[in-house]
């Protein structure tokens, strides 16, 4: 029996303390509390980047990351020669695992990967990999940028000096130098098979706190083909505590990724829980706003011939404007209502802006969680006239998430609508 339903939009912008009324008129607190221990932070809202400094003083420092790198002002540093990589060509062991931390997806490296050169003070060991991404359809998601150009995804590999510290965490807690590589992912027409183990892993950590072992991958294959062109600057961690201890290596050349592979990033969820109050939302736009350079100088590598190639192949957007990549803005006014004890009706309104009319139909995607299993279904609504769809066989003890996408005549898709959450047979979400 469906006792009653709580239904609300998933909060995609880290909103804090939103109140939504349930059908009995009582307010349900769905977001958020400040966690004990480490100070709570978010990518937007009341605990967003502009507020990080209140609990992490370093976040207001003068040598913060990320930054926009202006190539014309970067000076060639003769000390920045070829990187020496050790172990990067080996397949990862089956102990390597991935975790959805709620703020990013992290790969915890269990093998020996070392980097030296590039002006680093010693031989540094890779500890973990983290990713930052945007909202949808290849939108800007990188933290760093080059000449104002941001990329759909930025992968960051973090290193510490094992000769000085027994662990990465010790280096950070003692405020000592660590290294970080930033690698941009750029949209390409074809899947990048080197990313397959990562994409497969993402599907196993869709929900917050999920962990999964990764299929073997070669870390070198996740780096640009040419490592000779990179930028160097001294900055910080891009998340609290924002410690100004990072020697950044930012590769100029991107790694290809397909739209299909990008979808795996956009499908990641984050959740927060306080007492019995739960928020489930897509983890998107998990990047810190860019910081001022202040008195710092950005350097560029002096590797012979590495800067000779024309960079317009990726610095100019090969896919045109945002409007040329998507069919329309997202469908709006999403609603979910119970029809009876086992069926729901999803309704929406036509997108406000349509770049490539007409809209021929709509794709409805819904996922649900039951007994720790995550499932997803997608179906096409064949009419552009009747902007609603019925979902049958609804399970009363599952949490459902709904989103809708317009499909135009040329098969281009819109951005996804706001995500709606729905749970039945419950007093709280």
């Amino acid at each position: 029996v469906l006792h009653y339903v709580v239904c609300f939009p998933a909060l995609t912008e880290g909103y804090v303390g939103a109140l939504h009324e349930n059908r009995h008129g009582s307010a349900v607190q769905i977001r958020r509390r400040k966690a004990s221990g480490d100070p709570y932070w978010a990518y937007s809202g009341a605990y967003g980047p502009e507020h990080w400094v209140t609990s992490s003083v370093s976040c207001g420092g003068r040598h913060q990351s990320p930054i926009d790198i202006l190539d014309q002002y970067a000076r060639v540093g003769e000390e920045y020669q070829e990187l020496q990589l050790d172990g990067f060509d080996n397949e990862s062991s089956n102990k390597t695992w991935m975790k959805n931390t709620g703020k990013t997806v992290a790969i915890l490296l269990k093998d020996d990967y070392f980097v030296s050169g590039a002006g680093l003070p010693g031989r540094f060991k890779a500890e973990k990999v983290e990713f930052h991404w945007g909202h949808s359809n290849g939108s800007a998601g990188s933290e760093h940028s080059i000449n104002g150009r941001r990329f759909p995804v930025e992968m960051q590999i973090f290193f510490y000096n094992p000769d000085d510290f027994d662990s990465f965490q010790t280096a950070i807690s003692e405020n000592r130098i660590i290294g970080a590589m930033a690698i941009f992912f750029q949209v390409s027409p074809r899947d990048n098979s080197a990313l397959d183990p990562i994409i497969h892993g993402l599907k196993g950590v869709v929900h917050h706190e999920k962990e999964t072992f990764l299929d073997p991958f070669v870390l070198r294959d996740l780096l640009p083909a040419s490592l000779g062109s990179y930028y160097r600057y001294t900055g910080s961690l891009t998340t609290p505590p924002c410690s100004e201890i990072v020697e950044w290596i930012v590769f100029r050349r991107p790694v290809p990724i397909s739209y299909h592979q990008l979808e795996a990033f956009y499908s990641i969820f984050t959740t927060e829980q306080q007492d019995h109050v739960k928020s489930v939302e897509y983890l998107r736009n998990n990047f810190r706003p860019q910081q001022r350079l202040h008195d710092r100088v950005v350097s560029k590598s002096a590797v012979r011939d590495s800067w000779n190639h024309d960079m317009t192949d990726f610095l100019e957007n090969p896919l045109g404007t945002e409007a040329s990549k998507v069919c329309s803005s997202p469908p709006i006014h999403m609603k979910v209502q119970p029809l009876n004890q086992t069926a729901l009706q999803v309704s929406w309104s036509q997108p406000e802006t349509i770049y490539h009319p007409p809209i021929m139909n709509y794709m409805i995607s819904y996922s649900w969680t039951k007994n720790e299993d995550e499932k997803e279904k997608t179906f096409t609504k064949d009419s552009d006239k009747d902007l609603k769809a019925t979902i049958s066989h609804v399970s009363p003890d599952s949490l459902y998430l709904f989103r809708v996408q317009a499909v135009c005549r040329n098969d281009m898709r819109s951005d996804f609508s706001q995500t709606m959450l729905f749970q039945a047979n419950t007093t709280r979400i």
Epitope: Q350, I354, H356, P357, P358, I359, M360, N361, D382, S383, D384, K385, D386, V407, C408, R409, N410, D411
Partner: antibody
């Protein structure tokens, strides 16, 4: 004023390739879509295919494989090419401008048509 | 691909009201449009998006839609309304996109 006219009709032999041209004036093909429709003598209207303002072509299921629609925006022309014609392709061929709305398509302006006869 | 079914012929007395139907074989497809074609002439758009009339079309012509049936209603039929009437709609996307006409209804105005 805005209009379009079909040309290239006439007598063709079976197995010939048919090439018809729709010449438009008063509007641009880079912002308008054109459909081709035919009508056999005494029969109803039958959609053949279309080309949209970005140059993407679409075809009726029966026309796929032997019909090709192209355009030359600088010449204001849309061309329909149909291979391996038979007597069943005898019809008046119309080009029509599509009115593409946010969520619907209709054919709001038609040429006078050009008659194609297939006979050995 | 789907099919639009229209009655082959309909008769109406001069000045009377007549409704022409167009039924899709599947429920609730895209919006319908209606075309009038007189002998030896090209078709003319009468109704678009189920119910809308282009400028220049007399308000005697109106459209409606319910479920999988679109209807063209002609009130106060005139001799000049004698013609073939076709409904049409579109469906699908990408390589499966289709624009489909009904078989047409021949309207005869008597009296």
């Amino acid at each position: 004023q805005e209009q379009q006219k079909e040309s290239g009709g006439g007598l063709f032999k079976p197995t010939d390739t048919l090439t018809l041209t729709c010449t438009v004036s008063g509007f641009s093909l880079s912002s308008n879509a054109i459909s081709w429709v035919r009508q056999a003598p005494g029969n109803g209207l039958e959609w053949i295919g279309a080309i949209d303002n970005s140059g993407s072509a679409y075809y009726a299921t029966w026309a796929k494989g032997r019909s090709t629609i192209t355009r030359a925006t600088n010449l204001n022309t849309v061309t329909l090419k149909m291979t391996s014609v038979t007597a069943a392709d005898t019809a008046t061929y119309f080009c029509a401008r599509e009115d593409v709305r946010a969520d619907s398509i209709d054919l709001n302006m038609w040429g006078p048509g050009t008659l194609v006869t297939i006979s050995s | 691909s789907f099919v639009l079914t229209q009655p082959a012929s309909v008769q109406v007395n001069l000045g009377q009201t007549v409704s022409l139907t167009c039924t899709a074989d599947t429920l609730s497809r895209s919006y319908a449009s209606w075309y009038q074609q007189k002998p030896g002439q090209a078709p003319v758009l009468l109704i678009y998006r189920d119910t809308s009339r282009p400028s220049g079309v007399p308000d005697r012509f109106s459209g409606s839609s319910s479920g999988n049936t679109a209807t063209l209603t002609i009130s106060g039929a005139q001799a000049g309304d004698e013609a073939d009437y076709y409904c049409a709609t579109s469906d699908g996307s990408g390589s499966s996109y289709q624009f489909v006409f009904g078989g047409g209804t021949q309207l005869t105005v008597t009296g």
